[in-house]
Interface confidence: medium
């Protein structure tokens, strides 16, 4: 921050440390980054709002992350650009403190959201049987609220009230920084809490996720070729469920039966997010079942999400029972990390030849699943998840490390780092908010399609885009 007095004048003339063309360049680059950050994060938020297929627990975390990143794109980036190009803080001490509080609270909330996502993925992989049951919208909301409240408690009071605690404001009018940062040791302490600790935790968690994925790939390789099918025959269920009034499976149907199939834990409990599109859609399987069902003589097919219903034995009686063949992942809307093995159930029918037809359908489905896989086997999905996880971790480390390394150096050598380097380092932390939508959302097919619809103003059927 290069401020100087004008020699011809007694008043302090604060001048920009940059030449005109440099100012234009900085404003253009910073403005573009701010715009991309705003658009990217708004797209994530709107996509989740308008597309019901994106309204999963995992994406609620992304929504919170996008909120934090959007605030950074709107306020933090632009005010810091103004501060950088002018060379001093022109908006007074109150706005300065409010900006700093917002900046640090939101940046910390962004990091905490990344931590939540990391823990969520970790538990999805390491506790596939118990965690999904606890993983409700309410629990997600509580975790998100905790991230924001904790960030606020950590930063806002200290930033806003430090001057009153020590009894004097030592920050000059044209300057804007956190007053307690005058102490390099305090700065380093906050860097540990805000960066080094989260990085260590995230690295350890992702290492565990990666290890769990690799061990599953090895297991898959050892298993017989039959198990390489998208739907392993040993995991296909054909069971009779007592019908209820809604012609839907009764209360025992839900998450529980999906936990252990044929006496063993599901084979492929992949975390959702970046393979959500592929996992949840099971489009090939749905089509195959439709074909099986339509080959039967008197059928009526209704397709909704992952369910193919086949009404058998038409009856004039409104209350006549139907057979429903349900295929695909059996996960409630809120959940997105439960095992992804396809299950097939045959829901009871008391119509003519009902049992017979159920058996035929069930047999045909089992037969269908034994056919060679057209899709890539699960290991490729595992690799994809691990790769995405690595990308996310690297994006965070690459963007946040330079500034925090400078803070570390600064503890031992104050004048070693030029102002320009500080500015670039500080900006890189902001750029993490630009990268996040790409890292977390663009690797998801449903997100990508929804983005495309939104950008091209194709609002028709956007709520059901898969």
């Amino acid at each position: 921050m290069n401020n100087s007095t004008n020699s011809s004048n007694n008043s302090l003339a604060l001048t920009s440390p940059y030449k005109t063309f440099e100012v234009v360049f900085i404003v253009l680059v910073a403005g573009s980054l701010s715009l991309v950050t705003i658009i990217g994060n708004i797209l994530v938020m709107v996509s989740i709002k308008v597309n019901r297929h994106l309204q999963t627990v995992n994406n609620y975390f992304l929504f919170s992350l996008a909120c934090a990143d959007l605030i950074i794109g709107v306020f933090s980036m632009n005010l810091y650009t103004l501060y950088t190009v002018i060379g001093y803080w022109p908006l007074g001490p109150v706005v300065c403190d409010l900006w700093l509080a917002l900046d640090y609270v939101v940046s910390n909330a962004s990091v905490m959201n990344l931590l939540i996502i990391s823990f969520d993925r970790y538990f999805c992989v390491t506790k596939p049987l118990t965690y999904p049951v606890k993983r409700t919208t309410k629990m997600a909301g509580m975790m998100i609220a905790a991230a924001w409240v904790l960030s606020f408690i950590l930063w806002a009071p200290a930033i806003l009230f430090w001057q009153f605690i020590v009894g004097v404001r030592t920050v000059e009018d044209g300057e804007c920084y956190i007053q307690f940062f005058s102490n390099a040791a305090v700065t380093f302490g906050t860097a540990i809490a805000a960066f080094y600790l989260p990085v260590i935790i995230m690295t350890v968690l992702y290492w565990h996720i990666s290890r769990a994925s690799k061990s599953r790939i090895k297991k898959d390789k050892k298993e017989p070729v039959a198990n390489q099918d998208p739907v392993s025959p040993s995991l296909v269920q054909g069971r009779i469920v007592k019908p209820n009034n809604n012609n839907m499976p009764s209360s025992d149907d839900g998450l529980e039966h999906n936990k252990i199939q044929n006496g063993k834990a599901p084979r492929d409990p992949v975390t959702e997010n970046c393979v959500q599109g592929e996992e949840k859609e099971s489009s090939n399987d749905s089509t195959s079942v439709s074909a099986v069902a339509s080959n039967m003589r008197d059928d009526e097919i209704t397709q909704d999400e992952n369910t193919v219903s086949t009404s058998l034995g038409h009856s004039k009686d409104e209350n006549s029972k139907q057979t429903c063949i349900r295929i695909g992942t059996k996960t409630p809307k809120s959940d997105s990390c439960t095992p992804t093995n396809t299950t097939v159930e045959v829901v009871g029918s008391s119509g003519q030849n009902g049992d017979e037809k159920q058996n035929i359908v069930a047999r045909k489905i089992v037969k269908m699943t034994k056919q060679p896989a057209k899709k890539k086997p699960p290991p490729s999905r595992e690799k994809k998840v691990t790769r995405t996880i690595l990308a996310i971790l690297l994006a965070f480390i690459i963007t946040w490390a330079p500034y925090n390394v400078m803070v570390l150096i600064n503890t031992f050598c104050a004048p070693c780092i030029p102002n320009t380097v500080w500015t670039i380092g500080y900006w890189l932390c902001y750029i993490n908010s630009t990268i996040n939508p790409a890292c977390y959302a663009l690797c998801n097919a449903t997100f990508k399609k929804t983005f495309k619809h939104l950008l091209m103003c194709h609002y028709k059927n956007i709520g059901a885009t898969r």
């Epitope: 100087s4 004097v168 030592t170 000059e172 956190i178 940062f181 005058s182 803070v407 500080w422």
Partner: nanobody, 121 residues
């Protein structure tokens, strides 16, 4: 903002002494490292002397070592440059400089308007 006002300059003979003062209107004078620079006609501005914010460390240009002494009085928000055994080559405009180094933000750099020192032989 921090305003710096130099005083004490003037015209002297070679071998004489002068004491320059720089008064700072700063909220936190104690957190600033203070320095003196000079600029002779037709030449670049050059470093003369500096004193750390705590007053424990001082630095001097080789050309003034042993002749000039920098000191500070935090109670008065003032920094001094005691110049002894002045030489004609010391003729220049002397500028006061205040630098506050903030971890995570970089330097805040302020300059005074300068005071003229003329040494004749």
């Amino acid at each position: 903002q921090v305003q710096l006002q130099e005083s004490g300059g003037g015209a002297v003979q070679a071998g004489d002494s002068l004491r320059l003062s720089c008064a700072a209107s700063a909220r936190s004078f104690v957190s600033y490292a203070m320095g003196w620079f000079r600029q002779a006609p037709g030449k670049e501005r050059e470093f003369v002397a500096s004193i750390s914010w705590s007053g424990t460390m001082t630095q001097y240009a080789d050309s003034v070592k042993g002749r000039f002494t920098i000191s500070r009085d935090d109670a008065k928000n003032t920094v001094y440059l005691q110049m002894n055994n002045l030489k004609p080559e010391d003729t220049a405009v002397y500028y006061c400089n205040a630098v506050k180094y903030i971890p995570g933000r970089g330097e805040y750099d302020y300059w005074g308007q300068g005071t003229q020192v003329t040494v004749s032989s």
